[in-house]
Amino acid sequence: YSHWPSCCPSKGYPSEELLRWSTVPVPPLKPASLDFHSVSCRASEDGPLNSRAISPWRYELDRDLNRLPQDLYHARCLCPHCVSLQTGSHMDPRGNSELLYHNQTVFYRRPCHGKKGNHKGYCLERRLYRVSLACVCVRPRVMG
Amino acid sequence: YSHWPSCCPSKGYPSEELLRWSTVPVPPLKPASLDFHSVSCRASEDGPLNSRAISPWRYELDRDLNRLPQDLYHARCLCPHCVSLQTGSHMDPRGNSELLYHNQTVFYRRPCHGKKGNHKGYCLERRLYRVSLACVCVRPRVMG
């Protein structure tokens, strides 16, 4: 990674020049699928990808106003095994439904300290944050 | 989204106070799986999730030094249909291997313009960037 400075002093830049992060991110789901009670361990024939998958999942919100992005969504598998392609409901023990994880780059808003210890606006601290993206139907791992 | 200013003036803050984004992100794959020729349309019984999936995929690097994160990985499906759980190699036409997309928050480094048009360091411009996260085995959509 090349280095960028990440501090934003609160003064010294005209406020009208500031770019505002006001775009609303599109969650990778329909809001209804956030509700655990509206989904079950079955593969639908319509709807979003997470409900048509044979390893279906729901999304759970992770919100922190001092982080960018402020809203993240974590996948939660609805079935331990994969759903049969034939029926869309019965589970097939030959396949496991496993979470796919990803270390996402996020930025935290932190107070900045000046040379004399006084506050100088805020800093953006870059971190890696583990999120589960989806559930994937996999063949069970065979131990050698 | 709540609003944060996103400009980072290049002056006015002690350089030793700047946080440096030097952490290297862990890609969600082994480098070998970036090579298209080293993988094929089959579900492995070991290795990373993307090779054990019955909707296997490889990753392609997307690098932009003026973007944070600088490195993004796009999934590319290796099969049009899902691989049979039984054999791990033959395709099952009852299931489609579909890309899961996500609008990820990224930040572009842009020059900032002062009141008189002169450059004042750089600004971080927040954007949504479409990435493919994984390939998912789904039941084909039935049109009503």
Epitope: S10, S22, E60, L61, R63, N66, R109 | -
Partner: antibody, heavy 125, light 108 residues
Amino acid sequence: QVTLKESGPGILQPSQTLSLTCSFSGFSLSTSGMGLGWIRQPSGKGLEWLAHIWWDDVKHYKPALKSRLTISKDISSSQVFLTIASVDTADTATYYCARMGQLHYYGYDYAMDYWGQGTSVTVSS
Amino acid sequence: QIVLTQSPAIMSASPGEKVTISCSASSSVSYMYWYQQKPGSSPKPWIYRTSNLASGVPARFSGSGSGTSYSLTISSMEAEDAATYYCQLYHSYPPTWTFGGGTKLEIK
């Protein structure tokens, strides 16, 4: 100045639905980063967070009570509502509404910075 | 879900005595918030973000801590400090606010 005031039925019977209203002034719940929550306190006991609603209508509930709780808001009348289904004697408490959304130079605080005076609810047969 | 455990549950202190109230989290957290509540009144925010005193809070109060261990300290107990103190945190996933069980501080 910021004020919040809770209102409720006072007394209700087991299995009924409790409806609470929080009327507020001095701030707008449509302001980015603003939120309002409900907290209850049985007599002589501690504080228990129940539910929260954000400026963008995103809602959160205490997991153990999620199936019984519903929070909503009416921006035009500056009110937030909480309903608790199938109440029991264990739901007897003082119910508070409180604001969250204080923005400092370093970011948002997740403390409830303004509270109502509370409304007493008794569930009794 | 993170659990907050306050200790002691009840304590008494003489005027001028140093008082420390502890709050332990079941897993690591970034910040802790504290409230003061007196009988018949609503809770008042007392300490923000671990160590920042709310407006009007006397300078004899301080907050500190990190990870799983946080504390509120009164350098010199006064009669008006007799109250119940609660610690509180926000957890982003799943989004929940959690309160400690409270510490009732009495004056001797």
